[in-house]
Interface confidence: low
């Protein structure tokens, strides 16, 4: 039975050209985390494997940094980075847990005026 829950940073906004940390945390389970995948829509961004360490997809290796922890740091943000991000925890014996983060990348002037992304 899967008892765990994923806590994420939820819906976040960041400034174009800046950086952001995507964080997920698996709690309420004693299952062993074997691998965490970070995905953006149809694209695998990064893998953190318990045995093999980090792997960053080629198209993103210069803009994505592993960590902190099992999180992911996105750098040199563009408006095209706006969208859904998923942390997928592969665990034993529970199976797979998935967390969702929505990132909105704002033009600098918009960000400076305190605009926030909110789901209605």
């Amino acid at each position: 039975m899967m008892t765990g829950t994923i806590e994420t940073t939820g819906n976040i906004s960041a400034e174009k050209g800046g950086s952001i940390i995507l964080q997920c945390h698996l709690s309420s389970t004693t299952a062993q985390v074997t691998q965490v995948n970070w995905e953006q829509q149809d694209q695998l961004l990064a893998i953190c494997n318990a045995d093999l360490g980090w792997h960053i997809s080629p198209s993103f290796k210069d803009r994505v940094a592993p960590g902190p922890g099992l999180g992911l740091t996105l750098q040199s943000l563009t408006v095209n980075d706006t969208g859904e991000y998923f942390c997928i925890y592969h665990t034993y014996p529970d199976g797979t847990y998935t967390g969702r983060i929505f990132l909105e990348v704002l033009e600098s002037s918009v960000a400076e005026h305190g605009a926030r992304f909110q789901i209605p």
Epitope: L44, I47, N49, L52, H55, P58, S59, D62, N80
Partner: antibody, heavy 115, light 107 residues
Framework: EVKLVESGGGLVQPGGSLRLSCATS????????MSWVRQPPGKALEWLAL??????????EYSVSVKGRFTISRDNSQSILYLQMNTLRAEDSATYYC??????WGQGILVTVSS | DIQMTQSSSYLSVSLGGRVTITCKAS??????LAWYQQKPGNAPRLLIS???SLETGVPSRFSGSGSGKDYTLSITSLQTEDVATYYC?????????FGSGTKLEIK
């Protein structure tokens, strides 16, 4: 939905030239590495060329077998990938695939070099 | 250039059986390895990237393992639709070389 569609293949004489195109849709083209891969009939896949994304200055890399004869390029405004092939040889006959980082491939286009 | 060696050109396996396809790199590729499945007349299909990560929609009977220079694709409970040629590819350093392929057949 990510789509890659190759065109421009066909029959060409040895020593001739051909330009392959790969029209793409469903993703932000300039964000991704793009490649060309070929497969001669009944043989293995061969990686040919790579053009990196905007973040990496659209720099290119080639396999030894095509370096100096083939040129990979991209039109980011039209989301099209190209492969200019010059001084073609019989051994260049193959199905040519364009591919996007992340495992997306076109259906392939046949190029036959023969007199 | 990094050479990728798939030692078995052909493998014959019983339906429902387990098969292991190996791929050896001539130098360390730090898990930057992909496995592709190709059926006649079709483009290759990405199964696994980063040596271990199963692509969305790929059945869980496929798995990848390995590190350093040695990598493995395993298929359990072999199905008829798994009959295909399997290629490994390193993308640690250009040129991003492929293995010569392993053709899987049903015994």
């Amino acid at each position: 939905e990510v789509k890659l569609v190759e065109s421009g293949g066909g029959l060409v004489q040895p020593g001739g030239s051909l330009r392959l195109s790969c029209a793409t849709s469903g993703f932000t083209f300039s964000d991704y590495y793009m490649s060309w891969v070929r497969q001669p009939p009944g043989k293995a896949l061969e990686w040919l060329a790579l053009i990196r994304n905007k973040a990496n200055g659209y720099t290119t890399e080639y396999s030894v077998s095509v370096k100096g004869r083939f040129t990979i390029s991209r039109d980011n405004s039209q989301s099209i990938l190209y492969l200019q092939m010059n001084t073609l040889r019989a051994e260049d006959s193959a199905t040519y695939y364009c591919a996007r980082d992340g495992g997306y491939w076109g259906q392939g286009i046949l190029v036959t070099v023969s007199s | 250039d990094i050479q990728m060696t798939q030692s078995s050109s052909y493998l014959s396996v019983s339906l429902g059986g387990r098969v292991t396809i190996t791929c050896k790199a001539s130098d360390h590729i730090n898990n930057w390895l992909a496995w592709y499945q190709q059926k006649p007349g079709n483009a290759p299909r990405l199964l696994i990237s980063g040596a271990t990560s199963l692509e969305t929609g790929v059945p869980s009977r496929f798995s990848g393992s390995g590190s350093g220079k040695d990598y493995t694709l395993s298929i359990t409970s072999l199905q008829t639709e798994d009959v295909a040629t399997y290629y490994c590819q390193q993308y640690w350093s250009t040129p991003f070389t492929f293995g010569s392929g392993t053709k899987l057949e049903i015994k």
